[in-house]
């Protein structure tokens, strides 16, 4: 058993049929010595008396809010949560496996630049009695500070018969050094509590590996005289690290109709302009990627050809 | 050229060669990006490699103030990785293809280090750790880790030279 936060404790249980469970001793936080009784949740049934209560925790029915009283007055609470371990593996029932970029990916994180700011998100089908708390650091043995905000519900989607909820959190490294080569990864830890079930999820990454620039901005077209060619120009996204002579991007420019199966024109460039062939009913799209490190491409920025 | 005396390097040549190094580092093992090597406990390897750190003056302001600190750090790293790529880790079994990008990568690391420090001038170099994996699978894992780490190192070096070529070239 360990303390998650004040008066909230996590009991780690091996979860299999007829498992013996864990013996837990609860102590009432009071100077009082006698006349103390214990109850669980809303029940008035007295579970025991005395300053300590010894219980055998085997299942979710044994978890919950234990309260010690004296003469009708509440002295203190202890909330017991369960953390299940099945076949040596901690349960992951609360969050959905996003399967990208690999199986057992519950947390996904992205950064728009090298400033040390990043966003992580996760998915669940649970809509109520759900809380998250997020901690992060750079490195684990001698951790350096990363400050995370509160996790918030950022999107709701309907998937077949199910509703899916996306939560996200923003974090900022306290003393970020955008130009340095990271040697220690960022660690992100998410505590998830659903009713009386506790789970924790972790992710470890370098900012450089989760970079995904915003799409290029201000796409403009200039038709070239006596030609089907068009000069397309764009700018670096506002959110990208500066100066751009140091933090450079490379770009992919594509002309395509509405369907992916349609014919297209495509060219890669380090410049912020390119000449392409425009067709009626087609769109010109541009996306960006770090020039020197193969992290994710941005989403496309598009303008119609006509 | 970035000689210990403090004259300027051939920024544009360094830029071209460092960008080539980036391409080669990813070509040498593009799939490295799909392996989560941190799960393999890499303290003994990648903790020993020289990293370009915050105080090394490789940020735009540091380069403007005095690029020598940064260039010396990059030079150290280039020599370190050049030695690693020439070591038993890469020359032993399972043997690499004669024409794999690792060969070009090795040569280009040497080429860039020579651009930064012509013969006859000496900067301190870091000792290369004695990493002698006994099993081919260990060697393979070590290669992945070294290349992964090299990808990060040459990305910073390429930014430094691109910025230098754009803003510090005479």
């Amino acid at each position: 058993i360990w303390e998650l936060k004040k008066d909230v404790y996590v009991v780690e249980l091996d979860w299999y049929p007829d498992a013996p469970g864990e013996m837990v001793v609860l102590t009432c936080d009071t100077p009082e010595e006698d006349g103390i009784t214990w109850t669980l949740d809303q029940s008035s049934e007295v579970l025991g008396s005395g300053k300590t209560l010894t219980i055998q925790v085997k299942e979710f029915g044994d978890a919950g809010q234990y309260t010690c009283h004296k003469g009708g007055e509440v002295l203190s609470h202890s909330l017991l949560l369960l953390h299940k371990k099945e076949d040596g593996i901690w349960s992951t029932d609360i969050l959905k496996d996003q399967k990208e970029p690999k199986n057992k990916t519950f947390l996904r994180c992205e950064a728009k630049n090298y400033s040390g700011r990043f966003t992580c998100w996760w998915l669940t089908t649970i809509s109520t009695d759900l809380t998250f708390s997020v901690k992060s650091s750079r490195g684990s043995s001698d951790p350096q500070g990363v400050t995370c905000g509160a996790a918030t519900l950022s999107a709701e989607r309907v998937r077949g018969d199910n509703k899916e909820y996306e939560y996200s959190v923003e974090c900022q490294e306290d003393s970020a050094c955008p130009a340095a080569e990271e040697s220690l990864p960022i660690e992100v830890m998410v505590d998830a509590v659903h009713k009386l079930k506790y789970e924790n999820y972790t992710s470890s990454f370098f900012i450089r590996d989760i970079i995904k620039p915003d799409p290029p901005k201000n796409l403009q077209l200039k038709p070239l005289k006596n030609s089907r060619q068009v000069e397309v120009s764009w700018e670096y996204p506002d959110t990208w690290s500066t100066p751009h002579s140091y933090f450079s991007l490379t770009f992919c420019v594509q002309v395509q109709g509405k369907s992916k199966r349609e014919k297209k024109d495509r060219v890669f460039t380090d410049k912020t302009s390119a000449t392409v062939i425009c067709r009626k009913n087609a769109s010109i799209s541009v996306r960006a990627q770090d020039r020197y490190y193969s992290s994710s491409w941005s989403e496309w920025a598009s303008v119609p050809c006509s | 050229r970035a000689v210990p005396g403090g004259s300027s390097p051939a920024w544009t040549q360094c830029q071209q060669l460092s960008q080539k190094l980036c391409t080669l580092a990813w070509s040498a093992h593009p799939l490295v990006g799909h392996m989560d090597l941190r799960e393999e406990g890499d303290e003994e390897t990648t903790n020993d490699v020289p990293h370009i750190q915050c105080g090394d003056g490789c940020d735009p302001q540091g380069l403007r103030d005095n690029s020598q600190f940064c260039l010396q750090r990059i030079h150290q790293g280039l020599i370190f990785y050049e030695k690693l790529l020439g070591s038993d880790i890469f020359t032993g079994e399972p043997s690499l293809l004669p024409d794999s990008p690792v060969g070009q990568l090795h040569a280009s690391l040497l080429g860039l280090s020579q651009l930064l420090q012509p013969e006859g001038h000496h900067w301190e170099t870091q000792q290369i750790p004695s990493l002698s994996p006994s099993q081919p699978w260990q060697r393979l894992l070590l290669r992945f880790k070294i290349l992964r780490s090299l990808q990060a190192f040459v990305a910073v070096a390429a930014r430094v030279f691109a910025h230098g070529a754009a803003t510090l070239s005479p």
């Epitope: 060619q229 199966r261 014919k263 495509r266 890669f268 | -």
Partner: antibody, heavy 118, light 107 residues
Framework: EVQLQQSGADLVRSGASIKLSCTAS????????MHWVKQRPEQGLEWIGW????????EYAPKFQGKATMTADTSSNTAYLQLSSLTSEDTAVYYC???????????WGAGTTVTVSS | DIVLTQSPATLSVTPGDSVSLSCRAS??????LHWYQQKSHESPRLLIK???QSISGIPSRFSGYGSGTDFTLSINSVETEDFGRYFC?????????FGAGTKLELK
């Protein structure tokens, strides 16, 4: 199966013109760009130009402007290359090519050998 | 026009050898470079697009890398069916241009 059938070899007199054909099967040429590429004996490849059969748009390499004319007939699923004022320099194999992506050459015809005699 | 220089002009190899063919552009072309194989009396066929992207149906022994001005086509363990000419082609700007080719022949 995507295939391109090119017209047979031709021997033509210097100064004359010739029209080569390239008929597609297994796909509709409207959905592709059609290119023509020249290869002289024991030489490299030279790009002549492309046509978008959907709208008749064309783009020529400067070297072939005035020498080559590309057309396409979507009803017969055929692309054509006309070469005018032929000289011995035009003796070559001419390949037609169909591609979904404009700037590289995906599906090649077997080529038509054109020999210009004086 | 962008000029592509291929080297060597001829490469004599034994089946089982691994080889690298080089293509150098007269100016930076990012990764807008493609590789073709042409066997004797046949049409060319696309091997690699955009410097390193593989083409379905092409054996995995063919790989490409490079960006900017220097590009390489590697053939890991040459097979007898690989003999012929190899061309690079740039698509960075019009007109599209090809290299003069490298002839891969039996030693």
């Amino acid at each position: 199966e995507v295939q391109l059938q090119q017209s047979g070899a031709d021997l033509v007199r210097s100064g004359a013109s010739i029209k080569l054909s390239c008929t597609a099967s297994g796909f509709n040429i409207k959905d592709y760009y059609m290119h023509w590429v020249k290869q002289r004996p024991e030489q490299g490849l030279e790009w002549i130009g492309w046509i978008d059969p959907e709208n008749g748009d064309t783009e020529y390499a400067p070297k072939f402007q005035g020498k080559a004319t590309m057309t396409a007939d979507t009803s017969s699923n055929t692309a054509y290359l006309q070469l005018s004022s032929l000289t011995s320099e035009d003796t070559a194999v001419y390949y037609c090519n169909a591609t979904k992506e404009l700037r590289y050459f995906d599906v090649w015809g077997a080529g038509t050998t054109v020999t210009v005699s004086s | 026009d962008i000029v592509l220089t291929q080297s060597p002009a001829t490469l004599s190899v034994t089946p089982g050898d691994s080889v690298s063919l080089s293509c150098r552009a007269s100016q930076s072309i990012s990764i807008n470079l493609h590789w073709y194989q042409q066997k004797s009396h046949e049409s060319p066929r696309l091997l690699i697009k955009f410097a390193s992207q593989s083409i379905s149906g092409i054996p995995s022994r063919f790989s490409g890398y490079g960006s900017g001005t220097d590009f390489t086509l590697s053939i890991n363990s040459v097979e007898t069916e690989d003999f012929g000419r190899y061309f690079c082609q740039q698509s960075n700007s019009w007109p599209l241009t090809f290299g003069a080719g490298t002839k891969l022949e039996l030693k």
